[in-house]
Interface confidence: low
């Protein structure tokens, strides 16, 4: 299709060498009128179409993206080309940074509702670089952490660098829904909530004399609680002895419950001890059974084939640990009688 | 550009408590960690603990009966009090920046932004 | 809490060589390690994260390497402002702890 009739749209990401930081794209499609995408044609000039970054409308979740390659080949979509760009309804994704995603990125919808729509669609010229100025670096990441039922403030990475006072007019995203009430380079929460978590995009307008263009950087926003001041405890095994079979295979479940820690480093094993001795069994890995903002359970099972006689005089120990300290809980096996 | 500056008294008698104020500019205090650092003459770094723009501590277990680490997010400052010192305490304290770095699926935190030290004695 | 032991404590070298420190963690500390340079009379300055990821602006001579419990940082080729004392950090769990630290001298 013929793309000199998009609209154009410039844009900057600047992306910090240190993170693993992701970008959006949104497809700025004018806003529909009625069922159709778009009557560019129609309006008169005084009737200049409000832009949705991110599109209400269910017609608009399915446009079709196309980057627009330097040698002047035909348009690629996106989906077959890029496996590092993900499109989702309207926004596209970029996964890694890197300057090979500089390029013409165009958008339009899939389905051409009226001969109008044919020229409804966006060029989006995104020019990538690493960030040159070290220093500016260490002013804002793109995680952020908020923490639940204090105040907080979530900064554009991009502007943290200026102060308040010469800051430009920034245009800020949660989710993809525009937040209009904010325009400064820091969102201030008065009090956090698990709904503050998001990805939160932030844009401002930059100038020079030849053109102008958006400085767009990108947020993930955690919220969460403070680190835990509790040893984790054992929810299963509850009972320090379990009847079982001679000869049959047996399973025992240790299942604890960890508080949120920053840095989370969980232990959870079994050993065994038999008299005087004592060593750690080799067990299956340990996996996660529910994960929460407060704490997080873990699973691990230690596995006998078939229990023997010399099972019932050992004791089956599971420890748990995290930073502030650890938890025992044994269990002692006994033969089922009848 | 974040910048951090100790400041506090470079010298405290045995037995009583040292105060520093780590007064962060350039940035805000919030969303971060900051921890304190001490490097005794000639010796290595140690962590002494960390606080959350919040009030949310995490002490080193050697100094935690001794540690107060506090913030008053208002004036951009977060504090260190070192009670019942000895000439053992004697060292440059650092103040610094727990920042988190994105990696996929996790945070993976390093201090990226320090302050330039001060020096405490402890001598009476 | 968990130790880091690097060795050499301090080494020799001249400008142009190419240096390697190593830093032994007491127990597995997957990839939670950072490396730090300190000059006299001057606060450390970050250099390396997550074992082999290189800050922003540290210049491609310095690299890191490994996982676990074995670590290295290596200098390819030694410059006369890379004198200094270097040290490891790991963040896997708390206590956050320091290796003892590498001086660095010229020969």
């Known amino acids: 299709f013929n793309i000199s009739g998009c609209s154009t749209k410039k844009l900057l990401w600047t992306y910090s060498t240190r993170s693993e930081e992701e970008f959006v794209l949104f497809c700025d499609l004018p806003e529909p009128q009625k069922s159709h995408f778009c009557h560019r044609n129609r309006l008169s000039p005084k009737q200049v179409p409000e832009h949705l970054p991110f599109m209400g409308s269910n017609d608009l979740s399915d446009v079709q993206w196309y980057q627009q390659p330097s040698n002047g080949d035909p348009l690629e979509d996106i989906r077959k080309s890029y496996p590092h760009i993900i499109q989702d309804k309207c926004t596209l994704h970029f996964l890694t940074p890197g300057v090979n995603n500089s390029g013409s990125y165009i958008c339009r919808p899939k389905m051409i509702k009226s001969p109008y729509d044919v020229a409804c669609c966006v060029k989006m010229i995104l020019e990538v670089k690493p960030q040159t100025n070290a220093s500016c670096e260490y002013s804002a990441s793109h995680k952020q952490d908020l923490l639940l039922g204090s105040t907080g403030s979530i900064s554009c990475p991009s502007l943290s660098c200026q102060s308040d006072a010469q800051s430009p007019a920034v245009t800020w995203y949660k989710n993809g829904k525009l937040l209009s009430v904010e325009r400064s380079n820091r969102i201030v929460v008065d009090e956090v909530y698990d709904y503050h978590q998001g990805t939160y995009v932030c844009d401002y307008t930059q100038s020079d004399t030849v053109s102008s263009w958006t400085v767009r950087a990108v947020v993930q926003v955690r919220t969460i609680v403070g680190d835990t001041k509790l040893k984790p405890d054992i929810l299963d095994p509850v009972e320090d002895t379990l009847e079982v079979e001679l000869g049959k295979p047996l399973t025992i479940s240790c299942k604890a419950r960890f508080g949120f820690e920053r840095v989370f480093n969980p232990v959870i094993k079994w050993y065994i001890k038999d008299s005087d001795l004592e060593w750690e069994v080799s067990v299956p890995e340990a996996k996660s059974i529910k994960s929460t903002l407060k704490d997080e359970i873990i699973e691990r099972n230690i596995i006998l084939e078939k229990v023997t006689q010399r099972d019932l005089r050992r004791k089956f120990v599971c420890f748990v640990q995290n930073s502030i300290g650890n938890t025992t809980q044994s269990v002692q096996l006994k033969e089922k009688r009848g | 550009q974040v910048q951090l500056q100790e400041s506090g008294p470079g010298l405290v008698k045995p037995s009583e408590t040292l105060s520093l104020t780590c007064t962060v500019s350039?940035?805000?205090?919030?969303?971060?960690?900051w921890s304190w650092i001490r490097q005794p003459p000639g010796k290595g770094l140690e962590w002494i603990g960390y606080?959350?723009?919040?009030?949310?501590?995490n002490y080193n277990p050697s100094l935690k009966s001794r540690v107060t680490i506090s913030v008053d997010t208002s004036k951009n400052q977060f504090s260190l009090k070192l009670s019942s010192v000895t000439a053992a305490d004697t060292a440059v304290y650092y103040c610094?920046?727990?920042?988190?770095?994105?990696?996929?699926?996790?945070?993976?935190?390093?201090?990226?932004?320090w302050g330039q030290g001060t020096t405490v004695t402890v001598s009476s | 809490a968990i130790q880091l032991t690097q060795s050499p404590s301090s080494l020799s070298a001249s400008v142009g060589d190419r240096v390697t420190i190593t830093c032994r963690a007491s127990?597995?500390?997957?990839?939670?390690l950072a490396w730090y340079q300190q000059k006299p009379g001057k606060a450390p300055k970050f250099l390396i994260y997550?074992?082999?990821s290189l800050e922003s602006g540290v210049p491609s001579r310095f690299s890191g390497s490994g996982s676990g419990t074995d670590f290295t940082l290596t200098i390819s080729s030694l410059q006369p402002e890379d004198f200094a004392t270097y040290y490891c950090?790991?963040?896997?769990?708390?206590?956050?702890?320091f290796g003892q630290g590498t001086r660095l001298e010229i020969k």
């Open positions: 610094a920046r727990d920042v988190g770095i994105a990696a996929r699926n996790s945070y993976y935190y390093v201090m990226d932004v």
């Open positions: 350039g940035g805000s205090i919030n969303n971060y960690y």
């Open positions: 606080i959350f723009y919040s009030g949310t501590t």
């Open positions: 127990q597995g500390i997957s990839s939670a």
């Open positions: 997550e074992g082999s």
């Open positions: 950090q790991q963040f896997n769990s708390y206590p956050i702890t």
